[in-house]
Amino acid sequence: NFMYSKTVKRLSKLQEYQQYYPSLTCVMEGKDMEDWSCCPTPWTSFQSSCYFISTVMQSWTKSQNNCSVMGADLVVINTKEEQDFITQNLKINSAYFLGLSDPKGWRHWQWVDQTPYNKNVTFWHSGEPNSPDERCAIINFRSEEWGWNDVHCHVPQKSICKMKKIYI
């Protein structure tokens, strides 16, 4: 009975999410492998989040709106491990918007999800950020490594969206 009711709940939750995501990829996890964590197909998963690389070239504001429509935000990078996971799927000759900006040009960088900006956990390329006119952050490959650079927000770039995993 318990298993039956759990399955019914799961199915109704799945139907609910299918309005927004036509297809979900789920894996069993948890102590007793009773929980399913899902990401929309073809998003990738790492720890408790799902990631989508958008190859559509758009300004920072349009990129954030695009992620928002999908129930996500431009990516907030919290650890080096997370950045290393993300960059496995990026092209080295491209740049991708992050969810990091300095809208007033005061060098007060802020993440789109209001995560506090921690200077000790940043991955700026050497010499960056270097211009208060450039108020949005990208990740790109330079000097043999992935790092962040400040750029003009209205210049179209590819982007990375991030959302919390869906648990059913």
Partner: antibody, heavy 121, light 111 residues
């Protein structure tokens, strides 16, 4: 008082090259992102190129990409536009302008008087 | 590219009367409460001059008879009481996304 003075315009044959200059005074040039905007005779305004304050990031519309190169010399307070493979449709008055950010966008707040480029055989 | 469509192409207004110019963007140019539309004035033989930025902010030194309004895709420049020195072509411009694009211009004349 901010002054932007363009020079280098003239008559050039199709396929030819020209280098425009814009000498700035009255501003701390090295801290400004700069742009070029053009205006064909009797027509509207078209953005041509932008360069950031350090000169390491440059941006162009598709109409000039690969043919025009924007550059700057901060020690001389001068902005440049190298124009190659010129076409008749590049005929216009070319203005340099200072760029001022506004949150995620920008404005072009100071403009020079312009220099005229004519591409004709 | 974002297309900026201005109307009317030209406008004749009596001195002291109100002049209204419209600008429509092909997609929204708003984000987080700001609109990325600017207005410029260009008098014959002169470069453009910034009047309004961020849809409604009056540039320093510009008379307050000029005002801007709108959001999303629809924007308006208003001259509340036309003066002889306002005869010019007016352009809207979006700075939300490259390439920056301008409207085709509206020529304002005295009736």
């Amino acid at each position: 008082e901010v002054q932007l003075l363009e020079s280098g315009g003239g008559l050039v044959q199709p396929g030819g090259s020209l280098r425009l200059s814009c000498a700035a005074s009255g501003i701390t040039f090295s801290t400004y992102t700069m742009s070029w905007v053009r205006q064909a005779p009797g027509k509207g305004l078209e953005w041509v190129a932008t360069i950031n304050s350090g000169g390491d990031n440059t941006y162009y519309p598709d109409s000039v990409k690969g043919r025009f190169t924007i550059s700057r010399d901060n020690s001389k307070n001068t902005l440049y536009l190298q124009m190659n493979s010129l076409r008749a449709e590049d005929t216009a008055v070319y203005y340099c302008a200072t760029y001022r950010p506004y949150y995620y966008g920008s404005v072009l707040d100071y403009w020079g008087q312009g220099t005229t480029v004519t591409v004709s055989s | 590219d974002i297309v900026m469509t201005q109307s009317p192409d030209s406008l004749a207004v009596s001195l002291g009367e109100r002049a209204t110019i419209n600008c429509k963007a092909s997609q929204s140019v708003d984000y987080d409460g700001n609109s990325y539309v600017n207005w410029y004035q260009q008098k014959p033989g002169q470069p453009p001059k910034l009047l309004i930025y961020g849809a409604s902010n009056l540039e320093s030194g510009i008379p307050d008879r000029f005002s801007g309004s709108g959001s999303g895709t629809d924007f308006t420049l208003t001259i509340s009481s036309l003066q002889a020195e306002d005869v010019a072509v007016y352009y809207c411009q979006q700075s939300d996304e490259d390439p920056w694009t301008f409207g085709g211009g509206t020529k304002v004349e005295i009736k």
